[in-house]
Amino acid sequence: MRTEAQVPALQPPEPGLEGAMGHRTLVLPWVLLTLCVTAGTPEVWVQVRMEATELSSFTIRCGFLGSGSISLVTVSWGGPNGAGGTTLAVLHPERGIRQWAPARQARWETQSSISLILEGSGASSPCANTTFCCKFASFPEGSWEACGSLPPSSDPGLSAPPTPAPILRADLAGILGVSGVLLFGCVYLLHLLRRHKHRPAPRLQPSRTSPQAPRARAWAPSQASQAALHVPYATINTSCRPATLDTAHPHGGPSWWASLPTHAAHRPQGPAAWASTPIPARGSFVSVENGLYAQAGERPPHTGPGLTLFPDPRGPRAMEGPLGVR
């Protein structure tokens, strides 16, 4: 394959290639810029289906459309996990599966998709207007969540089309990491573009087809994403609420776990609160929450004691640290 990079700088281009070359040097950065802006946005799809055989039985299928490695999948109903939703199953690629009634069988379908069968009987059974959410934690993208529910007019056996409506619960580390790399790449690309534009071509004939390139708007938000900043946070109130008490059907894998330190060696950064930034909904339920673990406003006031190396005679409530509320 022949690329312009192989042409020595001082050598005149081959006849006939001059215009094409100028055109291609302009097109390539634009293609790369487009890739820059659109890269790193994985999606989660959710499909909810009512079984034809058992009218109160549901099958939820979820998938992750992204390049990262999945570290955890959480399926919940009644809303997103930790925000009014009740966890039905947690699936870990190595550690196994943990599920709770009315979840009957949770399993991995592929490396990036799972399915969950819910049995419906008794107080904890789902109903047609229940919202089911799937949250995929992956590296380096962060956590992404989408929710879906069975359409009101669904016949048994029919399924709702997969709803790739990501809640974009992006963990700070994942988002900043990927964005940082992409931003750096795009800025560097722009820098090269400008350098290329302002550098005089040595001993080359002036190009006949080199219109003035428009200034690249790197990372300019689209109208959709600009409008997103003004969309209110949408939640779905379902009349069918999950039971607040249920029994477990554990399918735990091997128990291994990151060591909890026995004492503080240093003062780490505290957990970041989720900063809610809504985005426009393409599916039934969409919100954006960016942060590490906490959802803003969920920590009760005057809760945790602070982790500190120094004794404080005023007691734990007086201390500040990553474990408590400042």
Epitope: R98, W257, G304
Partner: nanobody, 127 residues
Framework: HVQLVESGGGLVQPGGSLRLSCVAS??????????MAWFRQAPGKGLEAVAG???????TYADSVKGRFTASRDNAGFSLYLQMNSLRAEDTAVYYC???????????????????WGQGTMVTVSS
């Protein structure tokens, strides 16, 4: 709104046993934290991680309590227990239950992300 309520603290003689309990309750939904952990704070000392257990049942312990304390969770996933045996005077502290979620389901180091905390229960080991 999530609440953690500890119970089971009290006065016990050295070598004795106690069982602490912690229940996570939420208004309107069932909250199953990915991680639930016990921390303690002795009088005039800093906070110390005692034990943690994640959603898959994986446990970890501080060196000072290994072999004497056992952390467990109920099947439903929202209650945490700490069985304390062979108690010593240095185990005297306020014991706090903490809970929270992490991206990979594990208990995060140093307690980051454990956003919910109980008010604490006092354990006194004295003869």
């Amino acid at each position: 709104h999530v609440q953690l309520v500890e119970s089971g603290g009290g006065l016990v003689q050295p070598g004795g046993s106690l069982r602490l309990s912690c229940v996570a309750s939420a208004s309107g939904f069932t909250y199953r934290p990915y991680c639930m952990a016990w921390f303690r704070q002795a009088p005039g000392k800093g906070l110390e991680a005692v034990a943690g257990i994640d959603i898959f049942g994986g446990t970890t312990y501080a060196d000072s309590v290994k072999g004497r304390f056992t952390a467990s969770r109920d099947n439903a996933g929202f209650s945490l227990y700490l069985q304390m045996n062979s108690l010593r005077a240095e185990d005297t502290a306020v014991y706090y239950c903490a809970a929270g979620d992490s991206p990979d389901g594990r208990c995060p180091p140093l307690g980051q992300g454990l956003n919910y905390w109980g008010q604490g229960t006092m354990v006194t080991v004295s003869s």
